[in-house]
């Protein structure tokens, strides 16, 4: 709606951002799909969850994800401008006690079972993008977004604000 916000370039950036409250400001149960309307699905395999990006058959039920919204301070940059703005961060949980995590070493997105308080790897800055899409930026690795690669979710580095419109980091949220 506002257009694309751009890529965070501060070196300390989101690492230093603080979640204002321990409890979420609101929660939202939604299905997650790609810009090209492929569904994000979750399957239990060998006692662990796998994440897939796939075309669903007609009338096939979409998996739902619980988005928990948190208000967060956006830190001043290293030049010390002294201004802390506000951001919206989310955690994503497709099933009880499991959350999407950013594995920055492997550039992968994984489902981990964990207890609260959740680690920083489970938090993503939610970006309000054009064309009724959103994107998810890693709290632990600014400029790195959840994206689609080879029919899986992966972490994708976005090196300039012009590249934020890249379709593979755009997602749609729907109640249906």
């Amino acid at each position: 709606a506002f257009g694309i916000s751009g890529v965070q370039k501060y070196t300390r950036a989101l690492h230093d951002s603080s979640i204002t409250g321990i409890s979420p400001i609101t929660e939202y149960l939604a299905s997650l799909s790609t810009y090209n309307d492929q569904s994000i699905t979750f399957a239990l395999e060998d006692e662990s969850y796998e994440i897939y990006v796939e075309d669903l058959k007609k009338d096939e039920k979409k998996d739902k994800v619980l988005l928990s919204y948190y208000e967060s301070q956006h830190p001043s940059n290293e030049s010390g401008d002294g201004v802390d703005g506000k951001m919206l961060m989310v955690t994503l949980s497709p099933t009880k006690d499991f959350w999407l995590h950013a594995n920055n070493k492997e550039h992968s997105v994984e489902l981990h079972k964990c207890e609260k308080p959740l680690p920083d790897q489970a938090f993503f800055v939610l970006h309000n993008m054009h064309s009724n899409c959103v994107s998810f930026e890693c709290k632990t690795d600014p400029g790195v977004f959840i994206g689609v690669k080879d029919n899986h979710l992966a972490l994708i580095k976005v090196d300039s604000s012009e590249n934020l419109c890249t379709e593979n980091i755009l997602f749609k949220l729907s109640e249906t």
Partner: antibody, heavy 119, light 111 residues
Framework: EVQLVESGGGLVQPGGSLRLSCAAS????????VSWVRQAPGKGLEWVAT????????DYVDSVKGRFTISRDNSKNTLYLQMNSLRAEDTAVYYC????????????WGQGTLVTVSS | EIVLTQSPATLSLSPGERATLSCRAS??????????LNWFQQKPGQPPRLLIF???NRGSGVPARFSGSGSGTDFTLTISSLEPEDFAVYFC?????????FGQGTKVEIK
Amino acid sequence: EVQLVESGGGLVQPGGSLRLSCAASGFTFSSFSVSWVRQAPGKGLEWVATISGGKTFTDYVDSVKGRFTISRDNSKNTLYLQMNSLRAEDTAVYYCTRANYGNWFFEVWGQGTLVTVSS
Amino acid sequence: EIVLTQSPATLSLSPGERATLSCRASESVAKYGLSLLNWFQQKPGQPPRLLIFAASNRGSGVPARFSGSGSGTDFTLTISSLEPEDFAVYFCQQSKEVPFTFGQGTKVEIK
């Protein structure tokens, strides 16, 4: 300190043109969506136009479409509003405003520059 | 477009009193489970200042006496105990969709 400083306002005749500028400082300009919002004397606020951080997307209120053009130069940390075919009803204080990081609401505002369209 | 209607147009109160301002939208401003309704304060000769975003969350540096509530189409800004510096005009604004629209404003004046 985060700052937005508008300039370029003034008196112009109906049908004339004006170019407003907004100089940004204290933050990574290219990382944020920025907009113009105007306020006619003694009246309410009206959103005019928005441009994305990467210059990819622009949006306008219907009343200025085809007459106004929003643009930005990220290398100069500057936002622009080119206003053509100006009308009396465009008379207002024009504010430059920056969205929050993540692009959900207007977070930072400049002091505004007055545009008067009159013969 | 989404039309926002604020009431009352003017609120005459004394310092220390509670102020309750209303904003009604012509359609829901909910998106992605968020109520995309924001509140701004404006004093004469100054730009607007963000008070509340997403219906109920205070902007940076906003005192705790300001609070927002509501969902869907009906929203309220409450100032629990008016300070002298709170006498100003207050605008609601929706960021759900283009064109972004503002309410016509509520003036809070000293009684």
